[in-house]
Interface confidence: medium
C-alpha cells in the first residue's frame, strides 16, 4: 500500500458538539499540521476525503452523505452535521491525496447530551472579567460559518437556568452580552441560544461559557512578601530544624507568571552544599489572586547555616521584590556552675 | 478543610496555672499567625497575643505580659496557650484563631477559630 | 492602643428589617487601597464566625445580604433584610499595626 502521512489521532482537538444541534467541523490539516491552504491544494488536483470510527469500534468506514435531508454533508474543508445525533460519535479523519502525495489526520468528535439548564458533560471555555472595570462584554462563541450573514437569527441569553431579562448589571446586546459592573455574583455560567431558518427548517444553537471575575488591573500591586518580614526572627540552636516560609501575595494579572524563589548567600539552593528542602504550595482567592508559599526547610541546621543570608524574591509582571529573613543563632543561657567558680577565682 | 481543635474544659485554684492546647489540620501550620482571644462569661471577646509557629515568635497584649506563654510543636501542628498565676476573673472560654493573609503587611482577620475551651478558675 | 466603641449596644430588629452597626476607632485604621477593621457574628456558646474582612469584602460563604462600608476611623455593618438566623451578637475588630488586636465591646441584635 502506498505511504501515507499519518498525524495520528488529534486528542488536542477534543471536539464536543450538542445532539439535534448544527456543527461544522473544519479538517485540522489546513488549520495546524499542512503550510498550504484548502484552496491551493484542491487547485493542485489534491482530493479531501473523510472516513469515521464510530464508538467503540476498530472498523474504519466511509461517511454516509446520502442521507435524508443531507444530515451529514461536505463543503470544501468543512464536515457539517444538520444536526448531529448522539451516535455520530467517533473518530473523525479527513485525508488530502492525490496519486504522488497523501496526508491524513484524525480527531475525536464527542456529540454531548444537555438538559433543560444547559448542564452537559461539555468542557466550557472561561471568559476572565475584571472587577468593578467598567463596561466588559462576552460575545457568543463559533457560530461563524452557521448560517449567511442575510440571516438574522435570535439570540436569547441564559445565566445558569435563568433568561436574562431585566438582570441589575447584565444586558444582552444581540451576538453579545454586556456586564456594566462586574462582580463576584456575576461568576456563573452564561448560555446563548442562537436560532435562526435554513430551507424551511429551525436550527438551534447552543453554547455555554463560564464567566470568572478576577482582579482588576487597575488594583493590580507588585508582590507582596508577608514572610519573612521584620516582625518574625528565627532564632535556633545548631542541631535544630530551620523552617523558613516565603509567603507571597500576587495580585491577579492576566498571563502574568508569577515566581518565587529562595537564595542562600546569593545563590539558589541547588547551587550551595548544603542540605535544604523546598516546598511549595499555592492558593487562590475569588478573584484569582494567588498567594504562593515556598516552605526553606534545613533539617539538622548548623552554626555556619545560622550564619547565612537566606532571602526570599518574588517576581510578577508588575515588578520583582525581595526580603531577607532574620536568621540567628540562640545565645546559650549561662551555665550557672562555671560562673560561680570563675566569680570565685577558681582555676 | 481547615480546623482548629482546642483541649476540654479546666477547673483550677487560684494561683495555680492552665495550659490549653489547639490542634491545627488542613492548612499549612507554619505559615499563619494563630492568637488566643478570650471571653469571661457575658462579656466580650479580649485579644490576649499572637504566635508564628515557623519561628516561635510571640506578641502578648500589654494586660498579660509576664502572665501568658504561648508555644507550639510544629511536628504535631499544635500551639499551646499557657496563663498562669490565675484568679477567679481569668474565668473564661479561651480561643484559638487562625489569621488570614491580606495583600498588605499588619493587618489580618481572624478566619478560623476553635471552638473554645472553658477555663474556671475557683477556690 | 486603640480603641473601638461599637453601637448601639443592642438592637432589635423584626424578621425582614434593615439592621445597622456602627464601630468607632479612636484612630484611624486604614491606608491607600484597605482598611484594618472586621466584622464577626456569635451565636450563644459558639465561637465568633468571621463575616466581612477588610471593611467590606464578605467573607466566602457568607450571604450577601451582609455588608460592610467605611474607611479610616467609621465603620458600618448592615444586614439588608435581617433573617431568623442573624439574631446573634456582632463584633468589629481591628488588626492595624502589630502586635495589639482590639475588639468592639459588641451588639446584641434581637427579635422585636
Known amino acids: 500500500s502506498e505511504r501515507c502521512d499519518d498525524w495520528g489521532l488529534d486528542t488536542m482537538r477534543q471536539i464536543q458538539v450538542f445532539e439535534d444541534e448544527p456543527a461544522r467541523i473544519k479538517c485540522p490539516l489546513f488549520e495546524h499540521f499542512l503550510k498550504f491552504n484548502y484552496s491551493t491544494a484542491h487547485s493542485a488536483g489534491l482530493t479531501l476525503i473523510w472516513y469515521w470510527t464510530r464508538q467503540d469500534r476498530d472498523l474504519e468506514e466511509p461517511i454516509n452523505f446520502r442521507l435524508p435531508e443531507n444530515r451529514i454533508s461536505k463543503e470544501k474543508d468543512v464536515l457539517w452535521f444538520r444536526p448531529t445525533l448522539l451516535n455520530d460519535t467517533g473518530n473523525y479523519t479527513c485525508m488530502l491525496r492525490n496519486t504522488t502525495y497523501c496526508s491524513k489526520v484524525a480527531f475525536p468528535l464527542e456529540v454531548v447530551q444537555k438538559d433543560s439548564c444547559f448542564n452537559s458533560p461539555m468542557k466550557l471555555p472561561v471568559h476572565k472579567l475584571y472587577i468593578e472595570y467598567g463596561i466588559q462584554r462576552i460575545t457568543c462563541p463559533n457560530v461563524d460559518g452557521y448560517f449567511p450573514s442575510s440571516v438574522k437569527p435570535t439570540i436569547t441569553w441564559y445565566m445558569g437556568c435563568y433568561k436574562i431579562q431585566n438582570f441589575n448589571n447584565v444586558i444582552p446586546e444581540g451576538m453579545n452580552l454586556s456586564f456594566l459592573i462586574a462582580l463576584i455574583s456575576n461568576n456563573g455560567n452564561y448560555t446563548c441560544v442562537v436560532t435562526y431558518p435554513e430551507n424551511g427548517r429551525t436550527f438551534h444553537l447552543t453554547r455555554t461559557l463560564t464567566v470568572k471575575v478576577v482582579g482588576s488591573p487597575k488594583n493590580a500591586v507588585p508582590p507582596v512578601i508577608h514572610s519573612p518580614n521584620d516582625h518574625v526572627v528565627y532564632e535556633k540552636e545548631p542541631g535544630e530544624e530551620l523552617l523558613i516560609p516565603c509567603t507571597v501575595y500576587f495580585s491577579f494579572l492576566m498571563d502574568s507568571r508569577n515566581e518565587v524563589w529562595w537564595t542562600i548567600d546569593g545563590k539558589k539552593p541547588d547551587d550551595i552544599t548544603i542540605d535544604v528542602t523546598i516546598n511549595e504550595s499555592i492558593s487562590h482567592s475569588r478573584t484569582e489572586d494567588e498567594t504562593r508559599t515556598q516552605i526553606l526547610s534545613i533539617k539538622k541546621v548548623t552554626s555556619e547555616d545560622l550564619k547565612r543570608s537566606y532571602v526570599c524574591h518574588a517576581r510578577s509582571a508588575k515588578g520583582e521584590v525581595a526580603k531577607a529573613a532574620k536568621v540567628k543563632q540562640k545565645v546559650p543561657a549561662p551555665r550557672y556552675t562555671v560562673e560561680l567558680a570563675c566569680g570565685f577565682g577558681a582555676t | 478543610q481547615v480546623q482548629l481543635v482546642q483541649s476540654g474544659a479546666e477547673v483550677k485554684k487560684p494561683g495555680a496555672s492552665v495550659k490549653v492546647s489547639c490542634k491545627a489540620s488542613g492548612y499549612i501550620f507554619i505559615t499563619y499567625w494563630m492568637n488566643w482571644v478570650r471571653q469571661a462569661p457575658g462579656q466580650g471577646l479580649e485579644w490576649m497575643g499572637q504566635i508564628f509557629p515557623a519561628s516561635g515568635t510571640t506578641y502578648y497584649a500589654q494586660k498579660f505580659q509576664g502572665r501568658v506563654t504561648m508555644t507550639r510543636d510544629t511536628s504535631t501542628s499544635t500551639v499551646y496557650m499557657e496563663l498562669s498565676s490565675l484568679r477567679s476573673e481569668d474565668t473564661a472560654v479561651y480561643y484559638c484563631?487562625?489569621?488570614?493573609?491580606?495583600?498588605?503587611?499588619?493587618?489580618?482577620?481572624?478566619?478560623?477559630w476553635g471552638q473554645g475551651t472553658l477555663v474556671t478558675v475557683s477556690s | 492602643d486603640i480603641q473601638l466603641t461599637q453601637s448601639p449596644s443592642s438592637l432589635s430588629a423584626s424578621v425582614g428589617d434593615r439592621a445597622t452597626i456602627t464601630c468607632r476607632a479612636s484612630?484611624?485604621?486604614?491606608?491607600?487601597?484597605?482598611?484594618?477593621m472586621h466584622w464577626y457574628q456569635q451565636k450563644p456558646g459558639k465561637a465568633p464566625k468571621l463575616l466581612i474582612k477588610y471593611a467590606s469584602d464578605l467573607e466566602s460563604g457568607v450571604p450577601s445580604r451582609f455588608s460592610g462600608s467605611g474607611s479610616g476611623t467609621d465603620f458600618t455593618l448592615t444586614i439588608s433584610s435581617v433573617q431568623p438566623e442573624d439574631f446573634a451578637t456582632y463584633y468589629c475588630h481591628h488588626s492595624w499595626g502589630i502586635p495589639m488586636y482590639t475588639f468592639g465591646q459588641g451588639t446584641k441584635l434581637e427579635i422585636k
Open positions: 484563631a487562625r489569621t488570614d493573609f491580606y495583600r498588605y503587611d499588619g493587618g489580618y482577620a481572624l478566619d478560623y
Open positions: 484612630q484611624s485604621v486604614s491606608t491607600s487601597g484597605y482598611s484594618s
